[in-house]
């Protein structure tokens, strides 16, 4: 029986060009975490395996950093990073727990100001 719950940072926003930490926490279970996958829609961003450590998908290596903990840090954010992110906890004996985070990447206030009052 799966008794655990995933707590996440929920809906978050960050400025374009900045960075954000995606965090999930598994609680209310004594199940052993064997691996955590981080995914964006259907793309694998990173894996933290209990034996092997962190693996960052090659296409994200320059913008994704492992941690803190089992979390994930996204850097040099673009508006294309807006969307759903999933932490997938593989545990024993419970099975798989999934948490969802929605990230909205906003144009920075400076960029917005510049765009609005541009001299023709």
């Amino acid at each position: 029986m799966m008794t655990g719950t995933i707590e996440t940072t929920g809906n978050i926003s960050a400025e374009k060009g900045g960075s954000i930490i995606l965090q999930c926490h598994l609680s209310s279970t004594t199940a052993q975490v064997t691996q955590v996958n981080w995914e964006q829609q259907d793309q694998l961003l990173a894996i933290c395996n209990a034996d092997l450590g962190w693996h960052i998908s090659p296409s994200f290596k320059d913008r994704v950093a492992p941690g803190p903990g089992l979390g994930l840090t996204l850097q040099s954010l673009t508006v294309n990073d807006t969307g759903e992110y999933f932490c997938i906890y593989h545990t024993y004996p419970d099975g798989t727990y999934t948490g969802r985070i929605f990230l909205e990447v906003l144009e920075s206030s400076v960029a917005e100001h510049g765009a609005r009052f541009q001299i023709p």
Epitope: Q32, A50, L52, P58, H90, P93
Partner: antibody
Framework: EVQLLESGGGLVQPGGSLRLSCAAS????????MSWVRQAPGKGLEWVSA????????WYADSVKGRFTISRDNSKNTLYLQMNSLRAEDTAVYYC?????????????????WGQGTLVTVSS | EIVMTQSPATLSVSPGERATLSCRAS??????LAWYQQKPGQAPRLLIY???TRATGIPARFSGSGSGTEFTLTISSLQSEDFAVYYC??????????FGGGTKVEIK
């Protein structure tokens, strides 16, 4: 600390049988895939067999298919390799190794943790 | 069966120098490639997996690259403890999982 301890090796005549054991400790044995990998004296590494965490799925190298049987007893945290119809070319150090993956995450078939190995010598 | 070929068979390098080891697969293995180090009388030690990801605790002087059929393990500055035999291994999702013949890195 993950520990894998093989036993059961020794000298056996061609055509004979031997059963290797690998006692696992320091981790929850049940979910993890396990493998046997061998190394003939002075030679390279050869994957022999693998088994899923539940024991329901097994895989073998062609060189041992039909002669070797991999199994596990999760209640005893032990992996086995039953070797029948042994040949001179089966002479090797046999290592048991822990897969980093489980049924849920998928198996990797690479190995961070290995035992110290047990020597099997097939000779008349 | 996918055949893994390593070259050279023996590499003579002085401590502090760079060592470059090659591994070729007979057909594409994507990035499903691992590198191991083995010293006499010891079990292999996993260094690299997914072609370029260092396993936990492996020093940064070890790096892997490549995909498809051509792979490289680089040791940027050889330490005395790095003289050993190195094996590549492919782990495409279906068995058998095959190793290369090994490259012995010896002191020049």
């Amino acid at each position: 600390e993950v520990q894998l301890l093989e036993s059961g090796g020794g000298l056996v005549q061609p055509g004979g049988s031997l059963r290797l054991s690998c006692a696992a400790s320091g981790f929850t044995f049940g979910p993890y895939g396990m493998s046997w990998v061998r190394q003939a004296p002075g030679k390279g590494l050869e994957w022999v067999s693998a088994i899923s965490g539940s024991g329901a799925s097994t895989w073998y190298a062609d060189s041992v298919k039909g002669r070797f049987t991999i199994s596990r007893d999760n209640s005893k945290n032990t992996l086995y390799l039953q070797m029948n119809s042994l040949r001179a070319e089966d002479t090797a150090v046999y290592y048991c190794a822990k897969d980093p993956g489980t049924h849920y995450s998928g198996y990797y078939y690479i190995w961070r943790y290995w035992g110290q190995g047990t020597l099997v010598t097939v000779s008349s | 069966e996918i055949v893994m070929t390593q070259s050279p068979a023996t590499l003579s390098v002085s401590p502090g120098e760079r060592a470059t080891l090659s591994c070729r697969a007979s057909q594409s293995v994507s990035s499903n490639l691992a590198w191991y180090q083995q010293k006499p009388g010891q079990a292999p030690r996993l260094l690299i997996y997914s072609a370029s990801t260092r396993a936990t605790g492996i020093p940064a002087r070890f790096s892997g690259s490549g995909s498809g059929t051509e792979f490289t393990l680089t040791i940027s500055s050889l330490q005395s403890e790095d003289f050993a035999v190195y094996y590549c291994q492919q782990y495409v999702p279906h068995p058998p999982f095959t190793f290369g013949g090994g490259t012995k890195v010896e002191i020049k």
